[in-house]
């Protein structure tokens, strides 16, 4: 007996062939013995089964001898053997029909779990195994589940279910929901406009929600709340702003803050929530600022910075296009009695330069100037 | 939802081939058959053939016999239309073109794009 | 092969008018036709399948009528987007063949 795999929801054809190469009368019965359909002579008729609305066959095969039965919107319970009587022989086939469904939305916050559930006929056996767009494989019976899904499990799932040496592929799209970088680092002099960008990774047509930016300055005993907004159709509107930082924000997406000034009283991290409509849980992103101020005093120079910066970061104070006359592992420098001309504050990784301050040190006489 | 995605335009030479692709998503690709209909320019349409993409199996207008064949490739969904010694007169668009039955009848339900073969010296 | 004869080749209309093209088959093909409007520089669409059926999604001034040779593609109340190029197509066996097109201008 010949066995056919179909998928919930789609077309299987099931093949039946006559020797002679014309059209002759054939019918397709159910296990039942309940007529589904046949022919007389190029037109198709219909028995009382309940496949009737969805049944058909394929005029244009007959005339080569070849009459399919074609079932549409296939359900489990069409998992049945087929027999198809022509030339006064049957041809039997047995149809098996599986459904794999996410049985959560398939639009799911990053680190919430994943279920995909099989659904299969009476008697089946099957295996599955799920491939996820970033090449993991699961395994597993009846159910499978991934939890902490990753930003890198977006996109389209392949799953293959095996049953009698037979497969059948499905494919389920499934979007992660998560800011593009979990955190991000913004460094600037003092006094600089900062912006601070929240990408999605993902495109909905309809977002709706509510964040908040809540700040925990390096200088304050405890994190304040910033923003609160709302999202409507991707559309932002802000609920409640502080007065100091007076923080504005863009109307249209990606999720967009400026704040006027970079000040030391400011440097810290933050952490943008976006609570989505309907899904339970929240989008996180970190976002850091780095402030750099550089000063003289009477005979000393100074650089500083504040925010979180790690501890391998080198700030060091140099005279331009000269070796740097201090460099340390270490949130602020100095040098006593600078030399006239333009010194740099530079605070580097690695040797590459994050974030870099020009001051003029003018001859003793005069006051430094702040270019 | 279903997208035929064919292949750029061509230009070829008489008495050469061409190999026209068609890429289809959106549903199970082996569970619809698909036709190839053909358009001079300013003519009408010419049904060359179609392709059962489970099996292989063919049937091809007699006008083109001998000269088209259709085969598939299941693991990239995509089905292919070659028509080898090309003369002046097979300047057309070819689409392929998915089907949907209905009481025993295939009709033409979802199109390609289109792809211009342009047979010139 | 069937013949499929379509009248008339050309038509101009204007909005809001009821237009009819007919489609002559060389030889009885029951209800197996279908009807395809076509617009410049795009694929053919499915508009009426089996002589009568609505294909899912197009509107309701769109109807068909006719069994056997001959059949009537009808729009009761025509549109600006329905100036287009319409061919009917027998379906009965293969090679499918279509008529030759009519084309929907405006007036």
């Known amino acids: 007996k010949k066995v056919v795999l179909g998928k919930k929801g789609d077309t299987v054809e099931l093949t039946c062939t006559a020797s002679q190469k014309k059209s002759i009368q054939f019918h397709w019965k159910n296990s039942n013995q309940i007529k589904i359909l046949g022919n007389q002579g190029s037109f198709l008729t219909k028995g009382p089964s309940k496949l009737n609305d969805r049944a058909d066959s394929r005029r244009s095969l007959w005339d080569q001898g070849n009459f399919p039965l074609i079932i549409k919107n296939l359900k489990i319970e069409d998992s049945d053997t087929y027999i198809c009587e022509v030339e006064d022989q049957k041809e039997e086939v047995q149809l098996l029909v599986f459904g794999l469904t996410a049985n959560s939305d398939t639009h799911l916050l990053q680190g919430q779990s994943l279920t995909l559930t099989l659904e299969s006929p009476p008697g089946s056996s099957p295996s599955v195994q799920c491939r996820s767009p970033r090449g993991k494989n699961i395994q597993g019976g009846k159910t499978l589940s991934v939890s902490q899904l990753e930003l890198q499990d977006s996109g389209t799932w392949t799953c293959t279910v095996l049953q009698n040496q037979k497969k059948v592929e499905f494919k389920i799209d499934i979007v992660v929901l998560a800011f593009q970088k979990a955190s991000s680092i913004v460094y600037k002099k003092e006094g600089e406009q900062v912006e601070f960008s929240f990408p999605l990774a993902f495109t909905v047509e309809k977002l709706t929600g509510s964040g908040e930016l809540w700040w925990q300055a390096e200088r304050a005993s405890s994190s304040k709340s910033w923003i609160t907004f709302d999202l409507k159709n991707k559309e932002v509107s802000v609920k409640r702003v502080t007065q100091d930082p007076k923080l504005q924000m863009g109307k249209k997406l990606p999720l967009h803050l400026t704040l006027p000034q970079a000040l030391p009283q400011y440097a810290g991290s933050g952490n943008l929530t976006l609570a989505l409509e309907a899904k339970t849980g929240k989008l996180h992103q970190e976002v850091n600022l780095v402030v750099m101020r550089a000063t003289q005093l009477q005979k000393n120079l100074t650089c500083e910075v504040w925010g979180p910066t790690s501890p391998k970061l080198m700030l060091s104070l140099k005279l331009e296009n000269k070796e740097a006359k201090v460099s340390k592992r270490e949130k602020a420098v100095w040098v006593l009695n600078p030399e006239a001309g333009m010194w740099q504050c530079l605070l580097s990784d690695s040797g590459q330069v994050l974030l870099e301050s020009n001051i003029k040190v003018l001859p003793t006489w005069s006051t430094p100037v702040q270019p | 939802q279903v997208q035929l995605v064919q292949s750029g335009a061509e230009v070829k030479k008489p008495g050469a081939s061409v190999k026209v692709s068609c890429k289809a998503s959106?549903?199970?690709?082996?569970?619809?058959?698909m036709h190839w209909v053909r358009q001079a320019p300013g003519q009408g349409l010419e049904w060359m053939g179609i392709i059962n993409p489970s099996g292989g199996s063919t049937s091809y207008a007699q006008k083109f016999q001998g000269r088209v064949t259709m085969t598939r490739d299941t693991s990239t969904s995509t089905v292919y239309m070659e028509l080898s010694s090309l003369r002046s007169e097979d300047t057309a668009v070819y689409y392929c073109?998915?089907?949907?039955?209905?009481?025993?009848?295939?009709?033409?339900?979802?199109w390609g794009q289109g792809t211009l073969v342009t047979v010139s010296s | 092969d069937i013949q499929m004869t379509q009248s008339p080749s050309s038509l101009s209309a204007s909005v809001g008018d009821r237009v009819t093209i007919t489609c002559r088959a060389s030889q009885s093909i029951s209800d197996w036709l279908a009807w395809y409007q076509q617009k410049p520089g795009k694929a053919p669409k499915l508009l009426i399948y089996a002589a009568s059926s609505l294909q899912s999604g197009v509107p309701s001034r769109f109807s068909g009528s006719g069994s056997g040779t001959d059949f009537t593609l009808t729009i009761s109340s025509l549109q600006p987007e329905d100036f287009a190029t319409y061919y009917c197509?027998?379906?009965?066996?293969?090679?499918?063949?279509f008529g030759q097109g009519t084309r929907l201008e405006i007036k």
């Open positions: 197509a027998q379906h009965n066996h293969y090679p499918y063949t």
């Open positions: 959106g549903y199970t690709f082996t569970s619809y058959y």
């Open positions: 073109a998915k089907d949907i039955v209905h009481d025993g009848t295939e009709y033409f339900q979802h």
